[in-house]
């Protein structure tokens, strides 16, 4: 699992756009019944903010125990606090559930900084503001943890929505969403609208604020504007995609596109930042610095450490560039681009200076594990995880933060050749060499 502002602990050869336009994809292709339309009961079912993660209310056990659960597309375990912890207001009490079944098996998940461990079992699970179903799902009851739960975050567990391949202790532990789809008629798809505040929130405001929507089993048209553009899921483990080109204010970074996906590129709601491989990060920061050179910022700001403050309402958004990621399209030699604003990659931080200030952290950081499109990216877009068709869709979010001059965008098609070459093939370990 990732780290470095990777929640919960961690608080990641494009051709130029040509005149030739390919036929654009429309939303008018046949869909399964119930796939599209309105999902009123699920809209606004997420709370939180990008710095501490977005959570959904879930119930576990019989009688139902209500818990807030972090929505994490970068992992695959459903794991909940099951013992007292200083940062938890409540936890799962297995002994009070008549439907709990012990799997008599432990699970240990270490991170770069911190870990959690627990005991595996199954129980009945439902999502009050989700589909009207109850499923028996695997649950890791967290009995011990270090630097996992976040003080004041208001969530008590994590819902890993990625694929079984990265489940712990191994891929035989069926993830929650797989169980949901198998046991019910819910289509194999979910979509996320994460709504960044755009301004600092104090604790009471966070608890009262709406953080976005997780639409389980479908797509809600009210949550986005324009068209949805889809990129293939390269491999079903993380939600892995392929980036084919990166631009800062329209200027191509001009790197071998393999660098953008070294060693992978994933879409991860459990990571705060846009995380980039070292070489890409350095090139991107150099370009962002050049674009915003009328003002200089301390070195620690670009490392995501120091905060920069402006008098309330005077943040000079216009001096910071837009960032565009071109993603492989569904059609051969076709890509599309998603463009984020500084309103997405400068993360508001509250309560550090005076009330007369707006303070921000730079939310793009360096990664040794590939590109991670975290909340910084996702807060600009409505993101559809179409597992059934092995693709991820992006459209401009109806709730993204912008100003009167610029808006986030999803645009295409663009002609891009040899996109398959942009994917990095992680060397497989020859297990036989380990048998010594």
């Amino acid at each position: 699992t990732q780290h470095g502002i990777r929640l919960p602990l961690r608080s990641g050869l494009g051709g130029a756009p040509l005149g030739l336009r390919l036929p654009r994809e429309t939303d008018e292709e046949p869909e399964e019944p119930g796939r599209r339309g309105s999902f009123v009961e699920m809209v606004d079912n997420l709370r939180g903010k990008s710095g501490q993660g977005y959570y959904v209310e879930m119930t576990v056990g019989s009688p139902p125990q209500t818990l807030n659960i972090l929505v994490d597309t970068g992992s695959s375990n459903f794991a909940v606090g099951a013992a007292p912890h200083p940062f938890l207001h409540r936890y799962y009490q297995r002994q009070l559930s008549s439907t709990y079944r012990d799997l008599r098996k432990g699970v240990y998940v270490p991170y770069t900084q911190g870990k959690w461990e627990g005991e595996l079992g199954t129980d009945l699970v439902s999502i009050p503001h989700g589909p009207n179903v109850t499923v028996r799902a695997n649950i890791a009851a967290i009995t011990e943890s270090d630097k996992f739960f976040i003080n004041g975050s208001n969530w008590e567990g994590i819902l890993g929505l990625a694929y079984a391949e990265i489940a712990r202790p191994d891929d035989s532990l069926e993830p929650f969403f797989d169980s949901l789809v198998k046991q019910t008629h819910v289509p194999n798809l979910f979509s996320l609208q994460l709504c960044g505040a755009g301004f600092p929130l104090n604790q009471s405001e966070v608890l009262a604020s709406v953080g976005g929507s997780m639409i389980i089993g479908g797509i809600d048209h009210s949550l986005y504007t324009g068209s949805l553009w889809y990129t293939p899921i390269r491999r079903e483990w993380y939600y892995e995609v392929i980036i084919v080109r990166v631009e800062i204010n329209g200027q191509d970074l001009k790197m071998d596109c393999k660098e953008y996906n070294y060693d992978k590129s994933i879409v991860d709601s459990g990571t705060t930042n846009l995380r980039l491989p070292k070489k890409v990060f350095e090139a991107a920061v150099k370009s962002i610095k050049a674009a915003s050179s009328t003002e200089k910022f301390p070195d620690g700001f670009w490392l995501g450490e120091q905060l920069v403050c402006w008098q309330a309402g005077t943040t000079p958004w216009n001096i910071f560039p837009v960032i565009s990621l071109y993603l492989m399209g569904e059609v051969t030699n076709q890509s599309f681009r998603i463009t984020i604003l500084p309103q997405q990659y400068l993360r508001p931080v509250e309560d550090v200076a005076t009330s007369q200030d707006d303070c921000y952290k730079f939310a793009i950081s360096q990664s040794s594990t590939g590109t991670v499109m975290g909340a910084v990216i996702m807060e600009g877009f409505y993101v559809v995880f179409d597992r059934a068709r092995k693709r991820i869709g992006f459209a401009v979010s109806a709730c993204h933060v912008h100003d009167e001059f610029r808006t986030a965008a999803v645009e295409g098609p663009f002609v891009t050749l040899d996109m398959e070459d942009c994917g990095y093939n992680i060397p497989q370990t020859d297990e036989s060499t380990l048998m010594t």
């Epitope: 200089k296 910022f297 301390p298 070195d299 620690g300 450490e305 120091q306 905060l307 920069v308 403050c309």
Partner: antibody, heavy 120, light 108 residues
Framework: QLQLQESGPGLVKPSETLSLTCTVS??????????WGWIRQPPGKGLEWIGN???????YYNPSLKSRVTISVDTSKNQFSLKLSSVTAADTAVYYC????????????WGRGTLVTVSS | EIVLTQSPATLSLSPGERATLSCRAS??????LAWFQQKPGQAPRLLIY???NRATGIPARFSGSGSGTDFTLTISSLEPEDFAVYYC??????????FGGGTKVEIK
């Protein structure tokens, strides 16, 4: 060796505008490596940051003083200046100009300071 | 707003003794903290930056430590010229604005 020197009147009347200039010698104010700033210290008290300026003219001010402060730069004269309007006796202080180095984070070089007294 | 509290307000020591000055931040400032020395009638002088790095020309007897909210300036063996007022400043929030109230190191 780079040096900073404050200059300006030592006495200002209440409600008037305090004006000080800092002259940079032994180096260029147009260096992209530094911001330039003003800090003050009332007699017998601690340090108070007033504001910073970059050679391009980009400024940052202390929110508590912002409505009264203007900092400007004149690269041709290798100088930057402070204006503080509507002064009162509470503005009596030693005023220092300083260089903000080490990745634009630390005041690593200071002028000797000049005492400005606000009195009628 | 981040508040820096220095203690003690006054430290009375003799030359050759070890001085330990404390600076506590009201919330974490990571390692973005500086220490300054100010002698009577003079401008402050940067001693330590990034909590533990000595500035150019600062003697080795001065050392800084700490991160987060608790920081210490240590003068291993006081020289006569070290008797002065010492200020800490956080630069975690930029532009750097917050200074501590100061600790006076005086001759006992």
């Amino acid at each position: 060796q780079l040096q900073l020197q404050e200059s300006g009147p030592g006495l200002v009347k209440p409600s008037e505008t305090l004006s000080l200039t800092c002259t940079v010698s032994g180096g260029s104010i147009s260096s992209s490596s530094y911001y330039w700033g003003w800090i003050r210290q009332p007699p017998g008290k601690g340090l108070e940051w007033i504001g910073n300026i970059y050679y391009s003219g980009s400024t940052y001010y202390n929110p508590s003083l912002k409505s009264r402060v203007t900092i400007s730069v004149d690269t041709s004269k290798n100088q930057f200046s402070l204006k503080l309007s509507s002064v009162t006796a509470a503005d009596t202080a030693v005023y220092y100009c300083a260089r903000l180095g080490h990745g634009y984070s630390y005041f690593d070089l200071w002028g000797r300071g000049t005492l400005v007294t606000v009195s009628s | 707003e981040i508040v820096l509290t220095q203690s003690p307000a006054t430290l009375s020591l003799s030359p050759g003794e070890r001085a330990t000055l404390s600076c506590r931040a009201s919330q974490s400032v990571s390692s973005y903290l500086a220490w300054f020395q100010q002698k009577p009638g003079q401008a402050p002088r940067l001693l330590i930056y990034d909590a533990s790095n000595r500035a150019t020309g600062i003697p080795a007897r001065f050392s800084g430590s700490g991160s987060g909210t608790d920081f210490t300036l240590t003068i291993s063996s006081l020289e006569p010229e070290d008797f002065a007022v010492y200020y800490c400043q956080q630069v975690y929030v930029w532009p750097p604005r917050t200074f501590g109230g100061g600790t006076k190191v005086e001759i006992k």
